[in-house]
Amino acid sequence: ESLGTEQRVVGRAAEVPGPEPGQQEQLVFGSGDAVELSCPPPGGGPMGPTVWVKDGTGLVPSERVLVGPQRLQVLNASHEDSGAYSCRQRLTQRVLCHFSVRVTDAPSSGDDEDGEDEAEDTGVDTGAPYWTRPERMDKKLLAVPAANTVRFRCPAAGNPTPSISWLKNGREFRGEHRIGGIKLRHQQWSLVMESVVPSDRGNYTCVVENKFGSIRQTYTLDVLERSPHRPILQAGLPANQTAVLGSDVEFHCKVYSDAQPHIQWLKHVEVNGSKVGPDGTPYVTVLKSWISESVEADVRLRLANVSERDGGEYLCRATNFIGVAEKAFWLSVHGPRAAEEELVEADEAGSVYAG
């Protein structure tokens, strides 16, 4: 079972709804526990086919590894099951949920294991560097939403006291190598990067050395970027329809938006014989309006028992905090005979669809 304290469960990738906000979820399990990872669909909408990945490799279901679209179970966990797990959309490979799982030797308990960072005095007069808390050094991948802060730590000891230096992708890493610089605390064996951006992605290595030896640790940083954009709309085909009087018509509009979109179905109307207002803005009437909770919404407008009055231009409009997107749909309503003739003409000409 996972630990329910905030110290243990600290969030997930910015794209994902989860128990704790906006970040990677870090979980600690005891040896022999069942690792259970849950990834509900964003906004409660449809999930679509997913794939579970550990340390970049797709997980193969087995008697011990149970894979479902929203849930992963690893039974009788061992240290080898530690790592970076993610649930991705199979088609786009978009990361829906990201977890850092650590399996410790001891069975899990609710107690916080945080203690002093300093190892007990070993009484050794001289010696090569060593990690003071090696059990804390086993997590290697850090996935962080852009604009947050990252700290890498490599607490070590040795006699004489070792020095620490940092590499990025195998090369010396200094403050001038990134906008915003870096902050080093040698006494805390740490490197801090504020307000990370995608260019900060890479492998970061601490090198700890004295005259008796050298140790190093490499961490991989992934910066999860939400590229904010206005909603993307895709019109369901056919976008333009001809309907018989009294029949039912349905328009489809697919809305993609990372940020919560406000979706509306509108119809162009005339007011006092005019289609536009004094400022040139078209007159519209709102048929449906709601806030979508999901990243991907398939929205429909159903018109029952259509009359000639229902003919005209319809709009699917989606607005988020970045901007607005619209798709136009046309409906022609005719009596039975006229509609049949129009359909024949459309067949001969090839159907015309809006982009």
């Epitope: 969030g11 910015a14 794209e15 906000p21 870090q26 600690v28 990252v150």
Partner: antibody, heavy 127, light 107 residues
């Protein structure tokens, strides 16, 4: 320029409700969190709760859990604090603050830092 | 909840003085400690995070130190704009908790 502007404060009777708004600008709303912190007259600061607008995930102080709800509308870049069943002890200036995480593999928690604050809005609960 | 205790509750000092405020946590909070400054009628401002990291734009006369349970905020040379109330805050545990504040007044 990062800005947070609270609104919606006022006088309300015990047991009543109020909704505070926090309009954010000057930063990517979906990357970081929004925290609410309150300060009773002449007293210190008390953390109320936090939301990450992208996911809608929230955390609350025990003193307000079940009575207060934090939400966000990313289309408006605005976070909200819905306060129900208000009590006299909820009287305070309420601040919203942009909140970011400090991620550190070495420890099993994320440190949350509130780097930009709004000017505050006063909520008075009195009959 | 983790209790944060600041001392002193208030102090009087003169411009140019070196001022030290301490904050003690009821349990180990590693280095997960921030310091904020608040002037009357204004919102708090972040000074220090992670115990010792100066936040962008904060003058270098402010410094923080400590880890575990004992932390210190030092103002090396007090300036007129530094007369204010200072709060420490931890965020390793849920909920985040603040100290009761230290008011720095003009002597």
């Amino acid at each position: 320029e990062v800005q947070l502007v609270e609104s919606g404060g006022g006088l309300v009777q015990p047991g009543g409700s109020l909704r505070l708004s926090c309009a954010a600008s000057g930063f990517t709303f979906t990357s970081t969190g929004i925290s609410w912190v309150r300060q009773a007259p002449g007293k210190g600061l008390e953390w109320v709760g936090r939301i990450y607008p992208t996911s809608g995930s929230t955390n609350y102080a025990d003193s307000v859990k079940g009575r207060f709800t934090i939400s966000a509308d990313t289309s408006k870049n605005t976070a909200y604090l819905q306060m129900n069943s208000l009590r006299a002890e909820d009287t305070a200036v309420y601040y919203c603050a942009r909140t970011y995480g400090i991620y550190d593999l070495y420890v099993d928690y994320t440190e949350y830092v509130m780097d930009y604050w709004g000017q505050g809005t006063l909520v008075t609960v009195s009959s | 909840d983790i209790q944060m205790t600041q001392s002193p509750s208030s102090l009087s000092a003169s411009v140019g003085d070196r001022v030290t405020i301490t904050c003690r946590a009821s349990q180990d909070v590693d280095t997960s400690l921030a310091w904020y400054k608040q002037k009357p009628g204004k919102a708090p401002k972040l000074l220090i995070y992670s115990a010792s990291f100066l936040y962008s734009g904060v003058p270098s006369r402010f410094s923080g130190s400590g880890s575990g349970t004992d932390f210190t905020l030092t103002i090396s040379s007090l300036q007129p704009e530094d007369f204010a109330t200072y709060y420490c805050q931890q965020s390793t545990g849920h909920p985040q908790t603040f100290g009761q504040g230290t008011k720095v007044e003009i002597k």
